[in-house]
């Protein structure tokens, strides 16, 4: 018999995206006569969610049968909640009026917060490869989560990293949020098999964090080391010279032999030997017919790796006085069958 009061018992309700939200509202009286309406927000810009009197509200159902005698429950359920539904909902009693109904009394409001899962973290690395001892940046992004509170951690091979910076946007209130983090990682020679992991924890994930990974193999370049050696003679007039290309990554490699500065042969590394740390080795060899030379020969192994500036190593092959008296062609032979070159680049030659 008290004058009508609008009771919204819950100050706040939290719902997972995709679920239904029940917003409770009760009246203490049937008088004054007039419809109940639900709004999101207050003031002139408020959004009509449900009108007892008229309209079509496909996502809204009333919890009670409103036409049932002595019903004072005007709770509603909103289906398929999304982050865009977040806000404060007001149950408002209107008094019949002419020509328009007049707002009589409003409930205190119920704040609906929507728990939305963050998207799977996407980790991206640097655009260009870097060599060991250099620092590279990895970014991690995730979107669409709510509420705003979120935890992001970085790991490298299971070890937590500390050199990173994280931002959650926007700074103010929003229906959903995004996170962006940049981690700085110092590369080491053994990082070909390494992984960086971005791990995100959020209330919606129930203790099972989301992870995004990136392989350092996409970010690292390990330059090769070259060693040119002469093997024992197969025959008195043949010299066997090998170029050992060691511990390089990635595999793209082109090798050129030069004799006294003139290109003798170019080949592209194909069948490689993979080391435990993920780097590769390759060997090329050259058979030199010493009879063909009257003077000493400088043999140069020149390697262009992953499109970088060529590196080279030279070996001085001494021709004995006896051999200088005879002349013949040079014979070359590769230790491994060459394949078509992977790259054709302009190279700079360095002779050591």
């Amino acid at each position: 018999e008290d004058e009508l009061q609008v009771i919204q018992p819950e100050k706040s309700v939290s719902v997972a995206a995709g679920e239904s939200a029940t917003l409770r509202c009760a009246m203490t009286s049937l008088i004054p006569v007039g419809p109940i309406m639900w709004f999101r927000g207050a003031g002139a810009g408020r959004e009509l969610i449900y009108n007892q009197k008229e309209g079509h509200f496909p996502r809204v159902t009333t919890v009670s049968e409103l036409t049932k005698r002595n019903n004072l429950d005007f709770s509603i359920s909103i289906s398929n909640i999304t982050p865009a539904d977040a806000g404060t909902y007001y149950c408002v009693k209107f008094r019949k009026g002419s020509p328009d109904d007049v707002e009589f009394k409003s409930g205190a409001g119920t704040e609906l917060s929507v728990r939305a899962k963050p998207s799977a973290p996407v980790v991206s690395g640097p655009a260009v490869r870097a060599t060991p001892e250099h620092t590279v940046s990895f970014t991690c992004e995730s979107h669409g989560f709510s509420p705003r509170d979120i935890t992001l951690k970085w790991f490298k091979n299971g070890n937590e990293l500390s050199d990173f910076q994280t931002n959650v946007d926007p700074a103010g209130d929003s229906v959903s949020y995004s996170i962006h983090s940049t981690a700085r990682v110092v590369l080491t020679r053994g990082d070909v098999h390494s992984q960086v992991i971005c791990e995100i924890a959020h209330i919606t994930l129930q203790g099972d964090p989301l992870r995004g990974t990136a392989n350092l193999s996409e970010a690292i370049r390990v330059p090769p080391t070259l060693e040119v050696t002469q093997q024992p003679m197969r025959a008195e007039n043949q010299a066997n010279v090998t170029c050992q290309v060691s511990n390089f990554y990635p595999r793209g490699l082109q090798l050129t032999w030069l004799e006294n500065g003139n290109v003798s042969r170019t080949e592209t590394a194909s069948t490689l030997i993979e080391n435990k740390d993920g780097t590769y080795n390759w060997m090329s060899w050259l058979l030199v017919n010493t009879c063909a030379h009257r003077d000493d020969v400088v043999l140069t192994c020149q390697v262009e790796h992953d499109g970088q500036q060529a590196v080279s190593k030279s070996y001085a092959l001494e021709i004995s006085a006896h051999q200088k008296e005879h002349g013949s062609d040079i014979t070359h032979e590769a230790a491994l069958a060459p394949t078509a070159p992977l790259h054709h680049h302009h190279h700079h030659h360095h002779h050591h």
């Epitope: 018999e1 008290d2 004058e3 006569v33």
Partner: antibody, heavy 114, light 111 residues
Framework: QVQLKESGPGLVAPSQSLSITCTVS????????IHWVRQPPGKGLEWLGV???????IYNSALMSRLNISKDNSKSQVFLKMNSLQTDDTAMYYC????????WGQGTLVTVSA | NIVLTQSPASLAVSLGQRATISCRAS??????????MHWNQQKPGQPPKLLIY???DLESGVPARFSGSGSRTDFTLTIDPVEADDAATYYC?????????FGGGTKLEIK
């Protein structure tokens, strides 16, 4: 217990104003609306208007220009003011409580006469 | 304004018999599943007293001899059986629309 008591001038000269006070006890004006109803001698009841708990009012459109209802919650008093009285405003004036007019005062008789 | 027309204006009923009073509204007084029609009893020199609210709900303390029925525009107050104390004027009243309005009254006399 719930009580409502009207107090008025009794006699009012034509074209003058009427002021009636309804003093309530046993409940708070912040919880209940108060309505005003009048009844000319030997005739039926006429609803004049209401003041809701928040202080907003609704008046009978036939009398709206002449009526004013106000209240003082702290004094538990509701006031009816009516101007330009004529002889046909002679009536018993009642205040009543709530949505179904469950509780009434005993009324105060107002006679408009020169 | 909604006009309420009561009939008869007066009636005399023998003690122990049934009294039926009618109230017709100029337009429907139903809204949102309820009929906002109420019945009051007034004895001479006294303020009105609520008997029935929302067309059929009996007010606390009122004898079950009183009952109300009807919807939309046609409503009935029934007193069965009538007792001597029931002699009074009966008013229907609506609050579905502003202004709230009363019927003209029906005077019940007990024979």
């Amino acid at each position: 217990q719930v009580q409502l008591k009207e107090s008025g001038p009794g006699l009012v000269a034509p074209s003058q104003s009427l002021s009636i006070t309804c003093t309530v006890s046993g409940f708070s004006l912040s919880s209940y609306a108060i309505h005003w109803v009048r009844q000319p001698p030997g005739k039926g009841l006429e609803w004049l208007g209401v003041i809701w708990t928040g202080g907003s009012t609704i008046y009978n459109s036939a009398l709206m220009s002449r009526l004013n209802i106000s209240k003082d919650n702290s004094k538990s008093q509701v006031f009816l003011k009516m101007n330009s009285l004529q002889t046909d405003d002679t009536a018993m004036y009642y205040c009543a409580r709530g949505n179904y007019l469950r509780y009434w005062g005993q009324g105060t008789l107002v006679t408009v006469s020169a | 304004n909604i006009v309420l027309t009561q009939s008869p204006a007066s009636l005399a009923v023998s003690l122990g018999q049934r009294a039926t009073i009618s109230c017709r509204a100029s337009e429907s007084v139903d809204s949102y599943g309820y009929s906002y029609m109420h019945w009051n009893q007034q004895k001479p020199g006294q303020p009105p007293k609520l008997l029935i609210y929302l067309a059929s709900d009996l007010e606390s303390g009122v004898p079950a001899r009183f009952s109300g029925s009807g919807s939309r525009t046609d409503f009935t107050l029934t007193i069965d059986p009538v007792e001597a104390d029931d002699a009074a004027t009966y008013y229907c009243q609506q609050n579905n629309d502003d202004p709230w309005t009363f019927g003209g009254g029906t005077k019940l006399e007990i024979k």
